[in-house]
């Protein structure tokens, strides 16, 4: 028979999305046991029928990758998990409505920091996502978010920071002291979606000035 409360078997059914990799996760409830099995279905908002996710039927792990199935940026999705205990009790819980554009979080960018004598150059590499374009290429975050920009900060000392920002990929902090260590932080920002990545950090030292030796 079904438990009085589905959360006895199943809790916290939700999408966890990062850079458009969309993973469905859940927890077992207080009455869940290691041999409880889980089956996952998903559907597009507006559709009537649920679709069983191959590879995520009667599994014991507590996650299921739905990146491909929820890969249309303009669609909204639901997923649901059905838990069945060894004793035959079952419970089903559904996610909130999921939009990858809205809900995905941004990982730190991939950046190359290059030391020079009196400057530090930072080159941001476009971040790939699992989403494929019609031509088979993987979309980058820049392809998806028109308003995406990079925010760069260079910690010069305890009281002074230099800032740069823009939609370009190459930046350079000038006027630095040779043979000195600096901490750089670079973040991706998308203001229209209120998104800000965790920072990429690089500790770099300007080159010694050999012209005086």
């Amino acid at each position: 028979h079904a438990p009085e409360d589905p959360s006895d078997l199943l809790q916290h059914v939700k999408f966890q999305s990062s850079n458009f990799e969309n993973i469905l996760t859940w927890d077992s409830g207080p009455e869940g046991t290691p041999d409880t099995v889980y089956s996952i279905e998903y559907k597009t908002y507006g559709e009537r029928d649920w679709v069983a996710k191959k590879g995520c039927q009667r599994i014991t792990r507590k996650s299921c990758n739905l990146t491909v199935e929820t890969g249309n940026l303009t669609e909204l999705y639901y997923a649901r998990v059905t838990a069945v205990s060894a004793g035959g009790r079952s419970a089903t819980k559904m996610t909130d409505r999921f939009s990858s554009l809205q809900h995905t979080t941004l990982k730190p960018p991939d950046v190359t920091c290059i030391s020079k004598v009196r400057s530090i150059q930072m080159i941001v590499h476009p971040t790939p996502t699992p989403i494929r374009a019609g031509d088979g290429h993987r979309l980058t975050l820049e392809d998806i978010f028109h308003d995406l920009f990079y925010h760069l900060e260079l910690q010069v000392n305890r009281t002074y920071q230099m800032h740069l920002g823009g939609k370009q990929r190459e930046y350079e902090f000038f006027g630095l002291t040779p043979d000195t260590e600096f901490l750089g932080t670079i973040m991706i920002c998308v203001p229209t979606w209120a998104k800000e990545s965790a920072p990429y950090m690089c500790r770099v030292k300007t080159l010694p000035d050999r012209t005086w030796t």
Partner: antibody, heavy 117, light 107 residues
């Protein structure tokens, strides 16, 4: 050398349709943000629409939503603007522009669209 | 939408004059303002991006300052070829919006 050449402008009656084209060369068209910008006679500049040629993601200014459609033919490096239900206030020179290395610094020469009975 | 209020709408300058054009954004756009120059019958030409960075090939008499909501374009010594209309553009969020323009004429 980056080149953008618009065509397809002309005189059309209110309620009519027109399709603008912009032939692009000199850069990687299939991985860029492309824009249509217009300028009414004696007036300022207004961004109308934008498309990412790889993802197909589009945005429009509110005044043209539901009437204008931006699209591309990546095989032919061409940007389009399908304009339906045209109004007299759509009369303008229409420019295409592109964002390269973060900057919107390449523009076409423009094509004139006149909506009048 | 972010509204860009540009002033003055026109100004008369003598050659060699220092000219200042201002743009006010209706909300913070950080440093995402670009300045364009447009001459009659031509497409706009990018002069300055990211508030203060000079586009390649643009004379150093053009400069930009500001942050947040208040921005300025300065021409330190107007030359005949600078007589044109100047527009600020916020490149922070869609829809990208221009100021109304400032026409710089000869006194």
């Amino acid at each position: 050398e980056v080149q953008l050449v618009e065509s397809g402008g002309g005189l059309v009656q209110p309620g009519g349709s027109l399709r603008l084209s912009c032939a692009a060369s000199g850069f990687t068209f299939s991985s860029s943000w492309m824009y249509w910008v217009r300028q009414a006679p004696g007036k300022g500049l207004e961004f109308v629409s934008v498309i990412n040629t790889r993802s197909g993601i589009t945005h429009y200014v509110e005044s043209v939503k539901g009437r204008f459609t931006i699209s591309t033919d990546n095989a032919k490096n061409t940007l389009f603007l399908q304009m339906n239900s045209l109004k007299s206030e759509d009369t303008a020179v229409y420019y295409c522009a592109t964002r390269i290395q973060g900057l919107i610094d390449y523009w076409g020469q423009g094509t004139q669209v006149t909506v009048s009975s | 939408d972010i509204v860009m209020t540009q002033s003055p709408s026109s100004l008369s300058a003598s050659l060699g004059d220092r000219v200042t054009i201002t743009c006010q954004a209706s909300q913070s756009i950080r440093s995402f303002i670009d300045w364009y120059q447009q001459k009659p019958g031509q497409a706009p030409k990018l002069l300055i991006y990211g508030t203060s960075r000079l586009e390649t090939g643009v004379p150093s008499r053009f400069s930009g300052t500001g942050s947040g909501t208040s921005f300025t374009l300065t021409i330190s010594g107007v030359e005949a070829e600078d007589l044109a209309t100047y527009y600020c553009l916020q490149d922070y969020s869609w829809p990208l919006t221009f100021g109304q323009g400032t026409k710089v004429e000869l006194k």
